[in-house]
Interface confidence: medium
Amino acid sequence: EMKKRVEDLHVGATVAPSSRRDFTFDLYRALASAAPSQSIFFSPVSISMSLAMLSLGAGSSTKMQILEGLGLNLQKSSEKELHRGFQQLLQELNQPRDGFQLSLGNALFTDLVVDLQDTFVSAMKTLYLADTFPTNFRDSAGAMKQINDYVAKQTKGKIVDLLKNLDSNAVVIMVNYIFFKAKWETSFNHKGTQEQDFYVTSETVVRVPMMSREDQYHYLLDRNLSCRVVGVPYQGNATALFILPSEGKMQQVENGLSEKTLRKWLKMFKKRQLELYLPKFSIEGSYQLEKVLPSLGISNVFTSHADLSGISNHSNIQVSEMVHKAVVEVDESGTRAAAATGTIFTFRSARLNSQRLVFNRPFLMFIVDNNILFLGKVNRP
């Protein structure tokens, strides 16, 4: 089942990336270097999707920058296939599933003076299920309320306050949001959740509710990158990968993150009996992508050099802000009760003892199905 997941894995986009750019991981590193001691959390598939959607209305070098930045080699597949691929993916992701909440969406808020091209609006709706809203940015408080209320409604109140402030000179604001909450295939026993120390640094220790469960997990020890990786399946197709770097090795692991590394992990997993200790946490990431994407070569679209003639006839239109917010909750709930009783762990004869894996220092996490839904670093649960 894990092998199937490897074969089906599309990293960051539904088209085979060219070797020039590893978009997902380059974006991760850009976010990490911008705020080294912060937690990071974003959805590569969701951001790729919104950029691909934007490329629908971009022309010449602006379009090329977006597609190359995404690492897409369009000799291998036509643009039409790219958009169709995302359309299919969106339909799959938005399908209601038991024990699986996923709200993913894109919206374009444009100044009242901007006339949108009908072809762009209909392509956005058809392919990306995206909405467009005329917005009075002169009333920045009202505009901000309009955007935040829209996202809160779409995510059933799970993502609120997407925007904290707003520039009244904005012309186009692109919003991309994703919320995920799913049930584990096997739940963690609530009785096993206890307050434990989490070492943010060797000097900074915080108390966190630590879930625990002994079970067979997909596990591997990556000696090259100095980390341990465990896969915890959700109900359905998704799996959470938790990566615990050895002490002092977080940067080494971050530098080694790549599509190849992820494929290797998924391929090399072995089923192992583990005593897994994992903090119960909710993590969110909110990013102004117009500040980060230029370092990945996607810059035109945010400047006066933007060619967005496919979006509007307005000659000087550019994307003022591109906001992405991703939220995930991790708790004990599962679709199947864990086999544990009130006694959490008992020691048996030496060799039968399962290995303890305690996520009590900063770690990385992926949530993958056939794509990387999320990628993050938990510095402080």
Epitope: K3, L221, R223, S226, R228, S246, E247, K267, M268, F269, K270, K271, R272, Q273, R351, Q355
Partner: antibody, heavy 119, light 111 residues
Framework: QVQLQQSGAELVKPGASVKMSCKAF????????IEWMKQNHGKSLEWIGK????????NYNEKFKGKAKLTVEKSSSTVYLELSRLTSDDSAVYYC????????????WGQGTSVTVSS | DIVLTQSPASLAVSLGQRATISCKAS??????????LNWYQQKPGQPPKLLIY???NLESGTPARFSGSGSGTDFTLDIHPVEEEDAATYYC?????????FGGGTKLEIT
């Protein structure tokens, strides 16, 4: 209980090949790797390679690449070691063993297969 | 490859006394606080038998008179009190890095 059963002794001519087997009993075959060792008469042990039935992963000691080949028959929980282009240096006892869960050595061993290369 | 050097090559110990075997690695066999160093016992005509794994953990079935210690590059196997049935060759083995390697062996004779 856990047991690894190896095929019988072999007497082979130089230049020929030999294929020996290691059949696992008493545990879930796909959970643990099977490792192979060579022991020259009265000498220490050398690791040849390992096969992980869980994902068909094979690892070889650089020294034995081109000499040794590991294959599997999952239906019978059997791993095979084939040695090619045999010389007198290949005369030894070959052991298969079950690799431990977390890379902590090998916890169960076969009885060994003695290979003698002689014309 | 990591080279493991065992000493002494052979050892004669009286019944009831202590036998100490040393194993030195050419580089550390530790990973993330764990030592990937194992000890085996081999008797003539038999396969090796795992005694101790992870430097100091007794494999189930290993008598308590066997103990292992050490970390990094220096490891020791102790047998006390030595019994008649402990006459065998002892090997250390590292599993921290591929290829796994074995020490040259120490032959223990009981007098």
């Amino acid at each position: 209980q856990v047991q690894l059963q190896q095929s019988g002794a072999e007497l082979v001519k130089p230049g020929a090949s030999v294929k020996m087997s290691c059949k696992a009993f008493g545990y879930t075959f796909t959970t643990y790797p099977i490792e192979w060792m060579k022991q020259n008469h009265g000498k220490s042990l050398e690791w040849i390679g390992k096969f992980h039935p869980d994902n068909d992963d094979t690892n070889y000691n650089e020294k034995f690449k081109g000499k040794a080949k590991l294959t599997v028959e999952k239906s019978s929980s059997t791993v095979y070691l084939e040695l090619s282009r045999l010389t007198s240096d290949d005369s030894a006892v070959y052991y298969c063993a079950r690799g431990h869960d977390y890379d902590y050595g090998m916890d169960y061993w076969g009885q060994g297969t003695s290979v003698t290369v002689s014309s | 490859d990591i080279v493991l050097t065992q000493s002494p090559a052979s050892l004669a110990v009286s019944l009831g006394q202590r036998a100490t075997i040393s194993c030195k690695a050419s580089q550390s066999v530790d990973y993330d606080g764990d030592s990937y160093l194992n000890w085996y016992q081999q008797k003539p005509g038999q396969p090796p038998k795992l005694l101790i794994y992870g430097a100091s953990n007794l494999e189930s079935g290993t008598p308590a008179r066997f103990s292992g210690s050490g970390s990094g590059t220096d490891f020791t196997l102790d047998i006390h009190p030595v019994e008649e049935e402990d006459a065998a060759t002892y090997y250390c083995q590292q599993s921290n890095e591929d290829p796994p390697t074995f020490g040259g062996g120490t032959k223990l004779e009981i007098t």
